[in-house]
């Protein structure tokens, strides 16, 4: 039975040319996280973080993605094309797979504030 919940940074906005942290957190379960996959709205992989094998940053993002903090990702040098959905997929044992969603809006303006966190069950 899957008892856990994924908490994400939710809907966030950031400035063009700046950077943003994409963060998910799995709570309410004792399941072991074996891997976290980060994917973009068009199903392109940004990165994988395997518990034993560490990080794999995919080539399309290798110059703009920094691993962490934790199981999260830092996306740098933002462009307007980065606007869209991002998904964190937590592979766990014995629960199975949990998925969280973040919507990133990249703004031209100089004011870009993070919105409040929200939970995805």
């Amino acid at each position: 039975m899957m008892t856990g919940t994924i908490e994400t940074t939710g809907n966030i906005s950031a400035k063009k040319g700046g950077s943003v942290i994409l963060q998910c957190h799995l709570s309410s379960t004792m399941a072991q996280v074996t891997q976290v996959n980060w994917e973009q709205h068009d199903h392109s992989l940004l990165a994988i973080r395997n518990a034993e094998l560490g990080w794999h940053i995919y080539p399309a993002f290798k110059d703009r993605v920094a691993p962490g903090p934790g199981l999260g990702l830092t996306l740098q040098s933002l462009t307007m094309n980065d606007t869209g959905e991002y998904f964190c997929t937590y592979h766990t044992y014995p629960d199975g797979t949990y998925r969280g969603r973040i919507f990133l809006e990249v703004l031209e303006s100089s004011v870009a504030e993070h919105s409040a966190r929200f939970q995805i069950p």
């Epitope: 992989l45 994988i48 094998l53 990080w55 794999h56």
Partner: antibody, heavy 118, light 107 residues
Framework: VQLQESGAELVKPGASVKLSCRAS????????VYWVKQRPGQGLEWIGG????????TFNEKFKNKATLTVDTSSSTAYMQLSSLTSEDSAIYYC????????????WGQGTLVTVSA | DIVMTQSHKFISTSVGDRVSITCKAS??????VVWYQQKPGQSPKLLIY???YRYTGVPDRFTGSGSGTDFTFTISSVQAEDLAVYYC?????????FGGGTKLEIK
């Protein structure tokens, strides 16, 4: 970058064998070493991988009770011990290395042929 | 475990022909797919990764495409030295798994 594997082995059923893979041309602790099995005339199977910087390993469950992965950082050598050998373990075993922040098998050793026969 | 299916075990082609090899994953693997070439008596070699990037030194006649569950590896103009077995592999989730291989035969 070179991965030099040990020579062919002829072993008896039930015995164990320890294969070696000596790395050169790069900093050994910076990259994972992976092992791949290929039975004669067959396809490829991923066995597992080891992080030379801390000895942490991950396995294909199928090989968890078959293979033991270790490293000796002083000699830049990775080892794989195979235990309780049967004819199903007769194969070529390759050590491989990934890219930086990459899981792709970018470099391969020449392979070690293990033959299990009475 | 994710099963990677290469539907053709053998493909027979002629020098200069365009040939495509397909690989289907049993579940979503995003873009975490790699293609290897193994010539007779040799270790495999990395050709394509992620799944459309050519590895260093790989001729531009080799290309890859796909996302999700369906992937294609193409040789735009087959050369005699391309005689080999080609394998797809996923590393979306462990255990990483390979396709059964497609042997390219030159007529």
């Amino acid at each position: 970058v070179q991965l030099q594997e040990s020579g062919a082995e002829l072993v008896k059923p039930g015995a164990s064998v320890k294969l070696s893979c000596r790395a050169s041309g790069y900093t050994f602790t910076d990259y994972f070493v992976y092992w791949v099995k290929q039975r004669p005339g067959q396809g490829l199977e991923w066995i597992g991988g080891i992080n030379p910087s801390n000895g942490g390993a991950t396995f294909n469950e199928k090989f968890k009770n078959k293979a033991t992965l270790t490293v000796d950082t002083s000699s830049s050598t990775a080892y794989m011990q195979l235990s309780s050998l049967t004819s199903e373990d007769s194969a070529i075993y390759y050590c491989t290395r990934g890219n930086f922040y990459g899981y792709e098998f970018a470099y391969w050793g020449q392979g070690t042929l293990v033959t299990v026969s009475a | 475990d994710i099963v990677m299916t290469q539907s053709h075990k053998f493909i027979s082609t002629s020098v200069g022909d365009r040939v495509s090899i397909t690989c289907k994953a049993s579940q979503h693997v995003s873009t975490a797919v790699v293609w290897y070439q193994q010539k007779p008596g040799q270790s495999p070699k990395l050709l394509i990764y992620s799944p459309s990037y050519r590895y260093t030194g790989v001729p531009d006649r080799f290309t890859g495409s796909g996302s999700g569950t369906d992937f294609t590896f193409t040789i735009s103009s087959v050369q005699a030295e391309d005689l080999a077995v080609y394998y797809c592999q996923q590393h979306y989730i462990t255990p990483w798994t390979f396709g059964g291989g497609t042997k390219l035969e030159i007529k």
